[in-house]
């Protein structure tokens, strides 16, 4: 996303012209020497400095086979130092050497910054025979040059044993300014300092930088890169970006929106997923979040009855799942929820409140006054009972549960019998003989089975030994259940 | 310590010429922008336009196009503002002053009084 | 242009007192800077980037304000503070100043 303009007029004189001894061109460069048929170069040059005696890297060749002379030095012939270009443009440089004809298999290498180039590189080597020597022109060319192609390049070629090594030729693709480092997306706290930073490279350099805030120039005068920006704080969201321009141009970074954190979005869509005698689960959606991250929520739940003291209570829970399970509510109650979630910054407004009821609950109470007695004419145990002052949370009573175990000789046995609502009295038929039969009484309304009453014993004798004395609950204040026989 | 020193008063005739000069010390001149404001007697604060210090360039605003200019003198880290064809309503005091981001002008000089009399 | 007008033009208060003096723009800005005037000075960098204080400005002087209502106050005015203070947006080019307001102490 970075856009690229070039300036026509460049009123800042960023770059200090070709230095010495270096070519500035967006033109192929070539020696001034033979070249292949069909390659014509735009421009041509010199050796610089032909008449420099060459002190670098050369070989020393033996006497030759007649034994009467030595041959010069071998050594790579002067070029262009420094060749300095535009980015896309194509480049052609070259390195020669002159070699006596006794020397055979003569193999000139490229090297760029100290590595071998192989492989898919356009290097051509041109040899041109003479009476003695043979003249070598290496040419490597560079279509559409890219900054990676920056750096130095050398000839090497190895002749009996010895390494000789040309003068570096230094490639420099100039372009528009490429950032390093461009300003990031970031929600900030309300009127806080903070910084934004932008770094862009060259070459050429220098690189300066301009920064720009929702279309208005921060900077009117360049700075340099890298360019850090203390932004003195904002009241809202603000876009910013940065130029970066040089010698050939300017390059603009992405904009980048700095959001201001403020409290959320209420949530919405709060919904009831389950109610119980005593609880209720919730769900909700949560809203914006004001470019904070949610820490937590509260659920808030009001008793919706005209003789509550309309106390709210207050369940904190964390930011996610989005859900909660709402205890400790009383059966058979109507209730209004509403939820309410946090940030770094504060809390939300509530969300909508809505209505939810609890379930039915289940008895809080046993039932009283519970009376056995054995009638052995009809070999059934007779059981009566009062209903149980239940309340209204509780729901409608539907019946009750009756426990009976029967225990004689080591071998225990529990029996459930159901009654209906409209019964204070159930018969039950003895189970064993010579046993003792322990009864307890629960009432039931559709929010579940309440607490059983305190257990009541009666022996049940073997047959014809029958006392009808009734065993009963014990009187309030009594410590155990009576047993009667 | 960063200061902008302005040149002295000056009593002009109508349709003269007179030119002000604004040195910085403290900083690297070419840094910042210098700025120019105009005060007429008994009146507030009115922006007339800045120089570039790095390019050299000019902007003036609306009112000041025409009979101002803005200069440099880079290697003495003076800032110059030439007022041509003086004219009664040119009569004020000028201040320079050192502009930093968001437009803050946070050095200014301690103003130039020009009289315009006949 | 984006206009800014102060107010009100003529502020008299007591040593002591609490004053609050406003920067309207017709059009909303990022940014308002003061600057304090005496008569016979240069002005002064007062307040910069809409509520941070410049070097040396008593801490009995804040700023505040957003989009295009701006006000600086002074919690307990002091002989000293009284000069013009003039408030500059930045927001949009030209970045013009406002009229001013004149602090005067009773």
């Known amino acids: 996303a970075i856009t690229e303009a070039r300036e026509e007029a460049k009123p800042y004189p960023l770059f200090p012209g070709p230095l010495p001894g270096s070519l500035q061109t967006d033109h192929t460069s070539l020696l001034s020497l033979p070249h292949t048929s069909g390659y014509q170069p735009a421009l041509m040059f010199s050796p610089t400095q032909p008449g420099r005696p060459y002190t670098g890297n050369v070989a020393i060749p033996r006497v030759t086979s007649a034994g009467s002379k030595l041959l010069p030095p071998l050594a790579f012939k002067h070029t262009v130092g420094h060749i300095i270009l535009s980015e896309h443009k194509d480049v052609k440089f070259n390195c020669s050497i002159s070699v006596p004809n006794i020397y055979q298999d003569t193999t000139i290498s490229w090297w760029k910054d100290g590595k071998e180039l192989l492989g898919a590189h356009h290097a051509i080597t041109q040899f041109y025979p003479d009476d003695e020597v043979t003249a070598i022109i290496a040419s490597f060319s560079i279509t559409s040059v890219q900054r990676s192609d920056n750096g130095s390049y050398i000839c090497k070629m190895k002749i009996n044993n010895e390494e000789i090594v040309s003068d570096p030729i230094y490639i420099e693709v100039q372009g528009l300014p490429h950032f390093t480092k461009q300003p990031e997306s970031m929600n900030v706290t309300r009127n806080t300092a903070f910084n934004l930073t932008c770094q862009a490279v060259g070459p050429p350099e220098p690189v300066n930088i301009f920064w720009v805030q929702n279309s208005s120039r921060v900077n009117e005068q360049p700075e340099k890169s890298p360019s850090v920006l203390t932004v003195p704080g904002l009241t809202e969201m603000a876009v910013f970006s940065c130029e970066a321009h040089n010698d050939k141009g300017l390059t603009v970074s992405k904009g980048v929106q700095i959001n201001i954190k403020a409290i959320p979005s209420p949530p919405t869509e709060v919904s009831i997923h389950n109610s119980t005698a005593h609880s209720i689960l919730i769900s909700w959606v949560p809203g914006f979040d004001g470019y904070s991250p949610f820490r937590n929520c509260s659920v808030q739940v009001k008793e919706v009855d005209p003789l509550s003291n309309g106390s709210v209570m207050i369940f904190n829970t964390s930011a996610s799942p989005h859900m909660y399970q709402i205890k400790q509510l009383q059966a058979l109650a109507n209730y209004s929820i509403g939820v309410s979630c946090m940030n770094e910054i504060g809390w939300s407004a509530v969300s909508p409140w809505i209505l939810a009821s609890t379930t039915e609950g289940a008895p809080s109470v046993a039932p009283l006054n519970v009376t056995v007695f054995l009638n052995e004419s009809r070999d059934n145990v007779d059981i009566r009972w009062m209903k149980p002052l239940t309340k209204r949370q509780a729901g409608e009573l539907v019946g009750y549960r009756i426990s009976h175990v029967w225990q004689s000789a080591g071998i225990s046995k529990e029996l459930l019998e159901e009654v209906g609502q409209n019964n204070s009295r159930a018969q039950i038929s003895v189970q064993v003989h010579n046993a003792t039969c322990t009864v307890r009484i629960a009432a039931v309304t559709k929010g579940g089975v309440g607490p059983f009453s305190d257990p009541v014993k009666i022996f049940i004798p073997a047959h014809g030994w029958v006392d009808h004395a009734p065993s009963s609950t014990p009187a309030p204040g009594n410590a155990d259940p009576v047993l009667i026989i | 310590q960063i200061q902008l020193v302005q040149s002295g008063p000056e009593l002009k005739q109508p349709g003269e010429t007179v030119k002000i000069s604004c040195k910085a010390s403290g900083y690297t001149f070419t840094d910042y922008g210098v700025n120019w404001v105009k005060q007429a007697p008994g009146k507030g604060l009115k922006w007339m336009g800045w120089?570039?210090?790095?390019?050299?360039?000019?902007t003036y605003a609306g009112d000041f196009k025409g009979r101002f200019a803005f200069s440099l003198e880079s290697s003495a880290s003076t800032a110059f503002l030439q007022i041509n064809n003086l004219k009664n309503e040119d009569m004020a005091t000028y201040f320079c002053?050192?502009?930093?981001?968001?437009?803050?002008?946070?050095?200014w000089g301690a103003g130039t009084s020009v009289t315009v009399s006949s | 242009q984006i206009v800014l007008s102060q107010s009100p033009a003529i502020l008299s208060a007591s040593p002591g007192e609490r004053v609050t003096m406003t920067c309207r723009a017709n059009s909303s800005v990022s940014y308002m800077h003061w600057y304090q005037q005496k008569p016979g000075s240069s002005p002064k960098p007062w307040i910069y980037a809409t509520s941070n204080l410049a070097s040396g400005v008593p801490a009995r002087f804040s700023a505040s304000g957003s989009g295009t209502s701006y006000s600086l106050t002074v919690s307990r005015v002091e002989a000293e503070d009284a000069a013009t203070y003039y408030c500059?947006?930045?927001?949009?080019?030209?970045?013009?100043f406002g009229s001013g307001t004149k602090l005067e102490i009773k």
């Open positions: 002053a050192r502009r930093v981001r968001y437009w803050y002008f946070d050095v």
């Open positions: 500059q947006q930045w927001g949009s080019n030209p970045f013009t």
């Open positions: 120089i570039n210090t790095y390019s050299g360039e000019p």
